[in-house]
């Protein structure tokens, strides 16, 4: 079995303030079992943007139906973008663990820049 890769195809995405930003991410394999999460930033101070397993993220919608069998697309859309949303976003695959899931592999990151709202 080929080892799972986390693919974030875009190094950067530029969005006008007030619009939605689509951040793309897909896996090359269904194995190992475990959730994906999106973070802004890296390291200990990173901010959780979306957790496939649990939580309430009102501005985030998934582009594909994550519950669909064999789904490999974990792209998200973030609505009503503001300058405060600028940063680098990482799609991270976790391996199912007990008691806690363990980080398995991260995508290379997508830098989101925010343009001024067109007048």
């Amino acid at each position: 079995e080929d080892e799972l890769q986390v693919i974030q195809p875009e190094k950067s995405v530029s969005v006008a303030a007030g619009e939605s930003a689509t951040l793309r991410c897909a896996m090359t394999s269904l194995i190992p079992v475990g959730p994906i999460m999106w973070f802004r930033g890296a390291g200990a101070g990173r901010e959780l943007i979306y957790n496939q397993k649990e939580g309430h993220f009102p501005r985030v919608t998934t582009v594909s139906e994550l519950t669909k069998r064999n789904n490999l697309d974990f792209s998200i859309s973030i609505s009503n973008i503001t300058p405060a949303d600028a940063g680098t976003y990482y799609c991270v695959k976790f391996r199912k663990g007990s008691p806690d899931d363990v980080e398995f592999k991260s995508g290379a990151g997508t830098e989101l820049s925010v343009r001024a709202k067109p007048s």
């Epitope: 080929d2 890769q5 693919i7 195809p9 689509t22 793309r24 897909a26 896996m27 090359t28 582009v63 594909s64 139906e65 490999l72 697309d73 792209s75």
Partner: antibody, heavy 122, light 108 residues
Framework: EVQLLESGGGLVQPGGSLRLSCAAS????????MSWVRQAPGKGLEWVST????????YYADSVKGRFTISRDNSKNTLYLQMNSLRAEDTAVYYC???????????????WGQGTTVTVSS | EIVMTQSPGTLSLSPGERATLSCRAS???????LAWYQQKPGQAPRLLIY???SRATGIPDRFSGSGSGTDFTLTISRLEPEDFAVYYC?????????FGGGTKVEIK
């Protein structure tokens, strides 16, 4: 420069066989799914078949299932399409194409060859 | 099997005009799996838009894609002489990776 070069087309009688090849260069061939797409004279594009980077997964259009076989030799950076029991309706230009990312069938095909012509006629 | 229907079949416009091409899926699909291609006579197709709305490398910003669910649109904001061609949408992700029938954008 990323390039795909098809070969192996020609004139064949109905019921005959042909093997198309696609030589790839300029990218890590084994990391990407590859596809064959055809276009009959004056018609639109028709997806034929796709193979994963490792060669472990293959996908076919119903119109060619059981007659065509897609394969790849990653050591030679070459994609193949073995076409058996050919019919007049298989007459077309056959293009090989590279998937945009390592994920099979996700975002589209970003590099295409110039095509090779297959004519099935008696 | 999901059917992709493109309309209109032919669009007759002048350079500088705006072109709006439609692609409709017979059932709801994920936008990540919708691509648009341009094909000129005697040439191979070229990827324009992936993921319904993202421009491929080197594609001018006069090309834009939008849509979700069953209805997708390719817009060319101001037609340049080199934009007159046939445009195809494609559904990826599942097998078969179905193409629409194409829209020919011709000079009026």
């Amino acid at each position: 420069e990323v390039q795909l070069l098809e070969s192996g087309g020609g004139l064949v009688q109905p019921g005959g066989s042909l093997r198309l090849s696609c030589a790839a260069s300029g990218f890590t061939f084994s990391s990407y799914a590859m596809s064959w797409v055809r276009q009959a004279p004056g018609k639109g594009l028709e997806w034929v078949s796709t193979i994963s980077g490792s060669g472990g997964s293959t996908y076919y259009a119903d119109s060619v299932k059981g007659r065509f076989t897609i394969s790849r030799d990653n050591s030679k950076n070459t994609l193949y399409l073995q076409m058996n029991s050919l019919r007049a309706e298989d007459t077309a230009v056959y293009y090989c194409a590279k998937d945009f990312t390592e994920v099979v069938g996700w975002l589209g095909m970003d590099v295409w060859g110039q095509g090779t012509t297959v004519t099935v006629s008696s | 099997e999901i059917v992709m229907t493109q309309s209109p079949g032919t669009l007759s416009l002048s350079p500088g005009e705006r072109a709006t091409l439609s692609c409709r899926a017979s059932q709801s699909v994920s936008s990540s799996y919708l691509a648009w291609y341009q094909q000129k006579p005697g040439q191979a197709p070229r990827l324009l838009i992936y993921g319904a709305s993202s421009r491929a490398t080197g594609i001018p910003d006069r090309f834009s894609g939008s849509g979700s669910g069953t209805d997708f649109t390719l817009t060319i904001s101001r037609l340049e002489p080199e934009d007159f061609a046939v445009y195809y949408c494609q559904l990826l992700g599942s097998s078969p990776r179905t193409f629409g029938g194409g829209t020919k954008v011709e000079i009026k």
